[in-house]
């Protein structure tokens, strides 16, 4: 806290300019008018203030706007944004995407801070849903943003926003998140033709049910092993050997290298050994000939 002292003669700031970098903290407090600062916030970012000095400028703005800064000031905070606490940001009402972009730019190249997380939360809640432009902006700055949301939060993403999602944006998503995103993606891309559809839907297939995988197997999609390994185990288990062969196309040979890993391992255990042998890959662990397979889960569902 800077103690209140009178401004030395001739030092009263007439405008926000570079001369202020030579002011000591107490001089900034005494000689810079908060209202002047608020109207000339756009200049602050271009001036090489230390963070110590920015602390003083923040204090002045806090006194001027105890209920929270207006958006006209927020948009021009620049590096001063880094001095804000989540509590400060919760007082704001940020509605402009341009304001959001300006503040995210300040933190660019750095991991998401609590300030940024709070800002995004305020912005998205203010909009009511995660629209395409917002999602586009957020994933451009933070590719992992989408996967940081809970399934409940993801449910507010409209299918139209899915067009903004890039494969790398889904890298850290878990199955629960993909379960929510996949139906939205399916809806968003439903009017595309086969091969184009597969390119777009591929990153979301970790949330696909068995019937959709069966449908894809009829379309010569040649799914790569990396995508196959991310599929839901419960969705893969009911697929027949013929269906997996069609689904993977030339990539089917990769099953051998993955035979000890899920979902391939569990899928092998569910297949007849005779059927596995038709692949000619030497996959072992299938059901021996003459054994009867009872699907107990189906029986339970019927009773």
């Amino acid at each position: 806290e800077v103690e209140k002292t009178a401004c030395p003669s001739g030092k009263k700031a007439r405008e926000i300019d570079e001369s202020l970098i030579f002011y000591k903290k107490w001089e900034l407090e005494a000689c810079v008018d908060a209202a002047l600062l608020a109207t000339q916030m756009d200049r602050v970012n271009a001036i090489p203030f230390t963070y110590e000095q920015l602390d003083v400028l923040k204090h002045k703005l806090d006194e001027l706007y105890p209920q929270g800064y207006p958006e006209s000031v927020i948009q021009h905070l620049g590096y001063l944004f880094l001095k804000m606490s989540p509590e400060d940001i919760r007082k704001w009402n940020v509605t402009s995407l341009e304001t959001l972009k300006a503040l995210l730019e300040v933190n660019k190249g750095h991991e998401m801070s609590p300030q940024v997380a709070t800002l995004i939360d305020r912005f998205v809640k203010g909009r009511g849903q995660l629209d395409k432009d917002t999602l586009d902006t957020l994933t451009a700055f933070y590719p992992g943003y989408l996967c940081s949301l809970s399934p409940e939060e993801l449910s507010s993403v409209p299918p139209s926003s899915i067009w903004a999602v890039r494969p790398q944006d889904l890298d850290t998503c878990d199955p629960r998140q993909l379960d929510v995103l996949y139906p939205k993606a399916r809806l968003a891309f439903q009017n595309m033709n086969g091969s184009e559809y597969f390119v777009k839907i591929q990153s979301f297939l970790g949330g696909a049910p068995t019937e959709d995988l069966k449908a894809l197997s009829q379309q010569n999609v040649s799914m790569d092993l990396a995508t196959f390994m991310k599929l839901r185990t419960d969705a893969v288990l009911p697929l027949t050997v013929a269906e997996v062969q069609k689904l993977l196309g030339p990539h089917v040979e990769g099953l051998k290298a993955e035979e000890r890993h899920r979902p391939v391992r569990d899928w092998i255990l569910r297949q007849r050994q005779d059927d596995l042998d038709t692949l000619g890959l030497g996959l072992q662990g299938g059901i021996p000939n003459g054994y009867l397979v009872l699907d107990l889960s189906m029986q339970e569902a019927l009773s």
Partner: nanobody, 115 residues
């Protein structure tokens, strides 16, 4: 984190010259601007000169025309060339880097101007 180590201080006669160096290490990519500050005995620390990442320089009135701030990006080093030194320039000189999201300071180097 950014680490700063100053060197080059010492005892010098009035009218003489000295060159201070400040070697930066650590997360130097996050540095926005750097500066030299000084603190004379019994006085507040004051800014002497600042240089931005694009090379724009700013000088306090009391050193204009006598001191020159510069940086060698290939060596990650900040310099302060001090000419026409006066007794009132006697102080501990500190290197400062303003980086995301705080100010980093060196330990200081003492410059004594005396005959």
């Amino acid at each position: 984190e950014v680490q700063l180590v100053e060197s080059g201080g010492g005892l010098i006669q009035p009218g003489g010259s000295l060159r201070l160096s400040c070697a930066a290490s650590g997360n130097i990519g996050s540095i926005r601007h750097m500066g030299w500050h000084r603190q004379a005995p019994g006085k507040e620390r004051e800014l002497v000169a600042t240089i931005t990442t694009v090379g724009t320089t700013y000088y306090a009135n009391f050193v204009k025309g006598r001191f020159t701030i510069s940086r060698d990006n290939s060596k990650n080093t900040l310099y302060l060339q001090m000419n026409s030194l006066r007794a009132e320039d006697t102080a501990v000189y500190y290197c400062r880097a303003t980086a995301h999201p705080t100010d980093y300071w060196g330990q200081g180097t003492l410059v004594t101007v005396s005959s």
